[in-house]
């Protein structure tokens, strides 16, 4: 449940940030989403959070970038490798992160519904069995 709330908050922050057109959005950052398919979510979140932390040194930090960093860090590994050579703009980075998060939210949302139905079925079945 908390995981889904955090993802929902991240998506909201990303929607706010990607709607902006200030000079910070043209900042060059590492493209951390070119990682191998078997890379864990926690590793990807850690890499994304590392990129956001580096933005602080460019003084492009704002409330929502801080919030994004805070929320990503809460779901991420503490350390991760950052050996990407490819680059992208901050705007593209945020857009790609948004797509990833929307997919995760959709998948987890469906899982939550499925789990709730399983619990409901189990409780109903259990109740019926005892009476």
């Amino acid at each position: 449940h908390n995981f889904n709330i955090t993802i929902k908050e991240i998506i909201k922050m990303l929607n706010i940030l990607t709607a902006r057109n200030d000079s910070c959005m043209e900042l060059t950052v590492k493209d951390v989403f070119t990682a191998p398919k078997n890379t864990s979510d926690k590793e990807i979140f850690c890499r994304a959070a590392t990129v956001l932390r580096q933005i602080y040194t460019h003084n492009c930090s704002n409330r929502y970038l801080r919030g994004l960093y805070r929320n990503l860090s809460s779901m991420a590994n503490k350390t991760c490798s950052m050996n990407e050579i490819k680059k992208s703009t901050l705007k593209d980075f945020l857009e790609r992160l948004k797509v990833i998060m929307q997919k995760k939210y959709y998948r987890h949302g469906l899982n939550d519904i499925f789990e709730a139905q399983k619990i409901e079925w189990h409780e109903h079945h259990h109740h019926h069995h005892h009476h």
Epitope: E9, K12, M13, N15, R20, N59, S61, R63, Y64, G67
Partner: antibody, heavy 119, light 107 residues
Framework: EVQLVESGGDLVKPGGSLRLSCVAS????????MDWVRQAPGKGLEWLSE????????HYADAVKGRFAISRDNAKNTVYLQMNSLRAEDTAIYYC????????????WGQGTLVTVSS | QSVLNQLPSLSMNMGETATFTCEGD??????VNWYQQKPGQAPVLTIY???KRPSGIPERFSGSNSGNTATLTISGARAEDEADYYC?????????FGGGTHLTVLG
Amino acid sequence: EVQLVESGGDLVKPGGSLRLSCVASGFTFSSYDMDWVRQAPGKGLEWLSEISTNGDRTHYADAVKGRFAISRDNAKNTVYLQMNSLRAEDTAIYYCVRDGYEYLAFDYWGQGTLVTVSS
Amino acid sequence: QSVLNQLPSLSMNMGETATFTCEGDNIGHKYVNWYQQKPGQAPVLTIYEDNKRPSGIPERFSGSNSGNTATLTISGARAEDEADYYCESEVSTGIVFGGGTHLTVLG
């Protein structure tokens, strides 16, 4: 305990200048963006300006752009507001505020310093 | 004219639910914070990021935000809740505050 203490408020004539100071304690000052917010007598709150952690980035409300300048000295845990070409409508209590990290909001406020612009 | 619009005043009997609104175009797509200010005092953060309570703020304070309206609710208003309440959000030009709502608690 987080504390923000403003000083420098005074009575000044229209067209005059004033520099407000805000000394911070109880937290790692250099890790936080800082802002100034004012409140005219009997009126609402008005955001004026923000400064980034190392002072490289500043941002101003249209009402004070070109007249006010925000700066900071991380070694002294102090943020400043230099106010030039003051007008009667600048009369207000000026608050120094911290832009939070845990809370994406102004999580701590000073008690304010009164600036009166009058001839 | 503020980008965030609040009603100037609200009167409640003690124990009733007080509902403050903050209206702005698509405000639900942004984060809204609420501050309480008592006479002669500095504002205090009361709700942050739409619906979260800072430590030390009583449970009777809650918030929500969707569409064009953000809401602050006090469930069971008390005499000490009499104050001005301001909503605030970040827009492209910077931070903006609503005009504030004064709550009177009758009792």
